[in-house]
C-alpha cells in the first residue's frame, strides 16, 4: 500500500473521523431549516461541501473507486455521497438557469445521516429487503382489491348518484332545465335533500332495503358523485381507490354507510368480507413480511 | 326504453265528463311528479294539473274544482278525471313525468318524458 492509502485508511477507520462526518450531517441540517439564511452562510455551505469531498476523497483513496469488489462505488450507500457531492458542485458552479429543482437534492444530504448511525443503517436495510419481500404480497393485494373493484364496479356502478329531488317544481320546470341552471351550491339545496351539516344530497336508493327519501322529495339519478365526485364506484380505477380506502381503513364507515344507502343493506355481506380479506388479513401478511425481513436483517 | 301513453281523449258536448290516463311502461324503478299539459291550437302549451309520488297534488286556476287528478303507482298510471268541460277545455292533452328507469344494460337513468298527447274537444 502506498503511504497515501495507508493514511487514508487510518483516518477512514478513526472514530472521530464517524464523529465529525455525524456532526457535519446534522449541522448542516440545522442549517438547511434556516427560512432567510444569513449571507455568511454561504461559505459554511461551501464548508460542508469541503467535508463531504474530503469524507468521500477519504474513503476512494483507501478502497479505490470502482474496480474491484469493496471498492468505493460498489456500497449503494456511497451511491448517496457521490450524488450529494456532484450535486453540491453542479448548484454551485454550473449556470443552469432554474436550480431550485436542483436545491431540492440538498435534502439528501439530510440522508447521509442513515449511514453513519449504525442502528438506522439496519432499519434502513430491512425496509429494502423488505420491499424486495413485499412485491409477491403486493401482487397479491393488487389482485384481491382488483377482483373487488370489478365486483363493485358491477354492483354499485352510478348508485352513488342517487339524490333526494323535491317534488313540488314550479310548472313549467323540469328536471332537465333545473340540472341545466344549477350553478351554486345554494341551488342544489334549493332543489335536493340536505340533512343539516351536509355537504353532499341525501342518498337514496330503488331498492326496498335502500335509504328512502322525506316527504316531498323522489329519488332520481343526477348530478355528480358524493364528496366532490371522488367517491364512486363508476369505474375501474375508482372503485380501486375506494377499495384501497377500505383496505386501509382510511374513513371507510363513511363509504359503508354512503353505499347502503344508495344500493342496500344487503351489500353490508360485500364490505364485510373485502374489511376482513383486505383489512385485516392483507394488512397484517404486509406486516408480517415486514417484520420478518427486519429480522432476518438483524441476524 | 320509457314511453308514456294517453288514452280517454275523444268528442265530449259542454257541460260533459272525460276520464285522461297516462301510462308508463319500461323498466321503471320510481316516477316522481306526474303532470298533465294541454296546448290549444294555436296557443302555447300551459299546464293543466300535477301530482307527486307521495299523491300531494297541485291544479290551474283555470281547471280548479273541475278536474281530478290521481294515480295508481302499482300501474305507473296517472289519470285526469275532467268534470264540467267548456269549449276553451279543447286542446291536445300531455302527460308529462319524471321517471328513474333501469335502461342500455341494466344503468340506470332519470329523466323527464313526454307522451304523444291525446285530443279533447268540446263541442255541442
Known amino acids: 500500500f502506498s503511504p497515501l492509502r495507508r493514511i487514508s485508511i487510518k483516518i477512514l477507520v478513526h472514530s472521530l473521523f464517524s464523529m465529525l462526518i455525524m456532526c457535519t450531517i446534522l449541522t448542516n441540517c440545522i442549517f438547511m431549516t434556516m427560512n432567510n439564511p444569513p449571507d455568511w452562510t454561504k461559505n459554511v455551505e461551501y464548508t460542508f461541501t469541503g467535508i463531504y469531498t474530503f469524507e468521500s476523497l477519504v474513503k476512494i483513496l483507501a478502497r479505490g473507486f470502482c474496480v474491484g469488489e469493496f471498492t468505493f462505488l460498489r456500497d449503494p450507500w456511497n451511491w448517496l455521497d457521490f450524488v450529494v457531492i456532484v450535486f453540491a458542485y453542479l448548484t454551485e458552479f454550473v449556470n443552469l438557469g432554474n436550480v431550485s429543482a436542483l436545491r431540492t437534492f440538498r435534502v439528501l444530504r439530510a440522508l447521509k445521516t442513515i449511514s453513519v448511525i449504525p442502528g438506522l443503517k439496519t432499519i434502513v436495510g430491512a425496509l429494502i429487503q423488505s420491499v424486495k419481500k413485499l412485491s409477491d404480497v403486493m401482487i397479491l393485494t393488487v389482485f384481491c382489491l382488483s377482483v373487488f373493484a370489478l365486483i363493485g364496479l358491477q354492483l354499485f356502478m352510478g348508485n352513488l348518484k342517487h339524490k333526494c329531488f323535491r317534488n313540488s317544481l314550479e310548472n313549467n320546470e323540469t328536471l332537465e332545465s333545473i340540472m341545466n341552471t344549477l350553478e351554486s351550491e345554494e341551488d342544489f339545496r334549493k332543489y335536493f335533500y340536505y340533512l343539516e351539516g351536509s355537504k353532499d344530497a341525501l342518498l337514496c336508493g330503488f331498492s326496498t332495503d335502500s335509504g328512502q327519501c322525506p316527504e316531498g322529495y323522489t329519488c332520481v339519478k343526477i348530478g355528480r358523485n358524493p364528496d366532490y365526485g371522488y367517491t364512486s364506484f363508476d369505474t375501474f380505477s375508482w372503485a380501486f381507490l375506494a377499495l384501497f380506502r377500505l383496505m386501509t381503513q382510511d374513513y371507510w364507515e363513511n363509504l359503508y354507510q354512503q353505499t347502503l344507502r344508495a344500493a342496500g343493506k344487503t351489500y353490508m355481506i360485500f364490505f364485510v368480507v373485502v374489511i376482513f380479506l383486505g383489512s385485516f388479513y392483507l394488512i397484517n401478511l404486509i406486516l408480517a413480511v415486514v417484520a420478518m425481513a427486519y429480522e432476518e436483517q438483524n441476524q | 326504453e320509457v314511453q308514456l301513453v294517453e288514452s280517454g281523449g275523444g268528442v265530449v258536448q259542454p257541460g260533459g265528463s272525460l276520464r285522461l290516463s297516462c301510462a308508463a311502461s319500461g323498466r321503471i324503478l320510481r316516477i316522481g311528479y306526474m303532470r298533465w299539459y294541454r296546448q290549444a291550437p294555436g296557443k302555447q302549451r300551459e299546464f293543466v294539473a300535477r301530482?307527486?309520488?307521495?299523491?300531494?297534488?297541485g291544479y290551474a286556476d283555470s281547471v280548479k274544482g273541475r278536474f281530478t287528478i290521481s294515480r295508481d303507482n302499482a300501474k305507473n298510471t296517472v289519470y285526469l278525471q275532467m268534470n264540467s268541460l267548456r269549449p276553451e277545455d279543447t286542446a291536445l292533452y300531455y302527460c308529462?313525468?319524471?321517471?328513474?328507469?333501469?335502461?342500455?344494460?341494466?344503468?340506470?337513468?332519470?329523466?323527464?318524458?313526454w307522451g304523444q298527447g291525446t285530443l279533447v274537444t268540446v263541442s255541442s
Open positions: 308529462e313525468a319524471l321517471v328513474t328507469a333501469s335502461v342500455r344494460g341494466g344503468s340506470i337513468h332519470s329523466g323527464t318524458y
Open positions: 301530482i307527486t309520488d307521495d299523491s300531494a297534488t
